[in-house]
Structures are given as structure tokens and as C-alpha cells.
Interface confidence: medium
Amino acid sequence: QLPPGKPEIFKCRSPNKETFTCWWRPGTDGGLPTNYSLTYHREGETLMHECPDYITGGPNSCHFGKQYTSMWRTYIMMVNATNQMGSSFSDELYVDVTYIV
């Protein structure tokens, strides 16, 4: 039994520039149940926010509804994988809604 492997945010999509969704690939689970959470901050802010909607985009996803989506901001996000043995973090991903399709 091991801590989880490093997850990877591999795709973000914004079909209408009003909402967007990002998906991650889990790393190895270490042989234990693993919880995933996506956190993000915006521009130069230090305040961290948790994913507002883990449901809409399906498994291993975070959906940002209209009220959370701004074409004026860069989102810096990462995924945390946690099991009883420890945690691991994805690399940070910088997302500008204007430039994702």
C-alpha cells in the first residue's frame, strides 16, 4: 500500500466561452481508495478555491459554471490525490478561457 501517484490535468474545454470544464487522469491508486480534489486560484490572487462542480463533466472532472467563468482571468489549477498513506499533487495548469476550444 502506497500513497497515490501523481495525477495530471490533461484537457480543458470551453465550447461557448461562458463555461469550461477540465479533466484529469488519476495516477496509480496505491492500492487504496483515493479522493481527488481540484483547487484553483486566479490571476495574482493567493486565495485558493475548490472546484465548484465535480458532477457535470463526469468522472475526474471539474466544471466551472457561468458565474465562475471569466474571460478576463487566468486560472491556475492543480489536482490533489489523497489516500490513507499520503497525498500527491499534479503540476499546476494555467488556463485562459479565451484560448481553449
Epitope: R42, E43, G44, E45, G65, K66, Y68, M71, R73, T98
Partner: antibody, heavy 115, light 111 residues
Framework: EVQLLESGGGLVQPGGSLRLSCAAS????????MHWVRQAPGKGLEWVSL????????SYTDSVKGRFTISRDNSKNTLYLQMNSLRAEDTAVYYC????????WGQGTLVTVSS | QSVLTQPPSASGTPGQRVTISCTGS?????????VHWYQQLPGTAPKLLIY???KRPSGVPDRFSGSKSGTSASLAISGLRSEDEADYYC???????????FGGGTKLTVL
């Protein structure tokens, strides 16, 4: 320490032009969208314009569309507002503000449009 | 006419609690956009007081608090002090204007 310093205000005749500058220091300017907000004498705050972190997107309040142009030079850490066809109702103190929430503001520069 | 509606004035005595309201519409506050509050002391530039409805930037006393519900928001100041005498503005993003909108401002007088 975050600092925003506006300049370029002054007295101009109706129909004239001015270019305002906002020099930024103490933070990574290119990470932030920037606003211009104005305040007419004795009145409240009025949002004027917004530019994205990379300069690729801009937005304006209706009353200045086609007359004002917001721009930025990230290599110089400077925000600009080019104001053409100025009207008496554009008379105000013009502030630049950092980020979508306006967490830091400059001290303002006064623009007076009068004949 | 401001897009967000605030009372033009409010007042209280030292130590009191005062509340300032900010009413918007379905294209701004009611669309789920965060409300921010700014304090403008006489002769100075505005300063961010509350952001994202209820969060205080570092250095802002916990006497200041914000809340939001539906198409309205409010700013509460408890333990009122003479140095709180200022103009207070709410602001939010507006979908239909694709920009910021402000309230008309509330002049707070400490009696």
C-alpha cells in the same frame, strides 16, 4: 509594495484628445487584467474600460465606445487610455485599478474638458 | 442612474452597527457574480474593503463584513468608529454590459 501611478491628465477643449498612463510597480503586471474607472466631481464611481492580462480582450462602457481606447505595454509595466473626441461629461478623476476585483487603485489623474 | 442601487446616505453613532444595501438584477448580482465593496475616504482613492461577497483583504478589520443573497448584497460595519466616515461603493460584473457596474455610493456619517 504595489503601486499604480496615473499621469497625463489636464485641461483640454471639447473635441480634443488626451492619453492617460498608469505606471505599475511592485507586482507582476502581466498577470493582471486592468481597469480604468472615473469619478466626476462630486459624483460616484463609473467603470470606463477593462483590458485582459495579455491585451487581447478589451471592453468599454457604452458612453466611451468608439472614442476611448485602452491598451497596455507589459514590457513597460504600463496601462494606457487614449481619449479622443472628448466631451464636457468626460470631466473626472481617472483611476487605474488592478485585477478583476480592483484590489489596488492609483491616486487618480484629473481630466477637465472645457472651453 | 446606477445599475446597482445603494441608499445615498447612512448614519450611526460610535459603537453602533450599520448596514448598507446594494441591489442589482439578474444580469449582475442575480447571475451569481461576486460583489465587491470599496471604501473611499474624503479626498482619497477608493480602497478594496470586501471582495467575493464576504472576504476581507489583509489589513481590513473584522468589523467589516459582507453578505449576498439573490440579487442583493449588504455591507455591515460593527463597532462604528469616526474614521469609518466615508463613501462606500458596491460593484459587480454585469453580463449585459460586459463590464463592471457600480452602485451610486453611500455616504456614511458617524454622528
Amino acid at each position: 509594495e504595489v503601486q499604480l501611478l496615473e499621469s497625463g491628465g489636464g485641461l483640454v477643449q471639447p473635441g480634443g484628445s488626451l492619453r492617460l498612463s498608469c505606471a505599475a510597480s511592485g507586482f507582476t503586471f502581466s498577470n493582471y487584467g486592468m481597469h480604468w474607472v472615473r469619478q466626476a466631481p462630486g459624483k460616484g464611481l463609473e467603470w470606463v474600460s477593462l483590458i485582459s492580462w495579455d491585451g487581447g480582450r478589451t471592453s468599454y462602457t457604452d458612453s466611451v465606445k468608439g472614442r476611448f481606447t485602452i491598451s497596455r505595454d507589459n514590457s513597460k509595466n504600463t496601462l494606457y487610455l487614449q481619449m479622443n473626441s472628448l466631451r464636457a461629461e468626460d470631466t473626472a478623476v481617472y483611476y487605474c485599478a488592478r485585477g478583476l476585483i480592483g484590489d489596488n487603485w492609483g491616486q487618480g489623474t484629473l481630466v477637465t474638458v472645457s472651453s | 442612474q446606477s445599475v446597482l442601487t445603494q441608499p445615498p446616505s447612512a448614519s450611526g453613532t460610535p459603537g453602533q452597527r450599520v448596514t448598507i444595501s446594494c441591489t442589482g438584477s439578474s444580469s449582475n448580482i442575480g447571475a451569481g457574480y461576486d460583489v465587491h465593496w470599496y471604501q473611499q475616504l474624503p479626498g482619497t482613492a477608493p480602497k478594496l474593503l470586501i471582495y467575493d461577497n464576504n472576504k476581507r483583504p489583509s489589513g481590513v478589520p473584522d468589523r467589516f463584513s459582507g453578505s449576498k443573497s439573490g440579487t442583493s448584497a449588504s455591507l455591515a460595519i460593527s463597532g462604528l468608529r469616526s474614521e469609518d466616515e466615508a463613501d462606500y461603493y458596491c460593484a459587480a460584473w454585469d453580463d449585459s454590459l460586459n463590464g463592471w457596474v457600480f452602485g451610486g455610493g453611500t455616504k456614511l456619517t458617524v454622528l
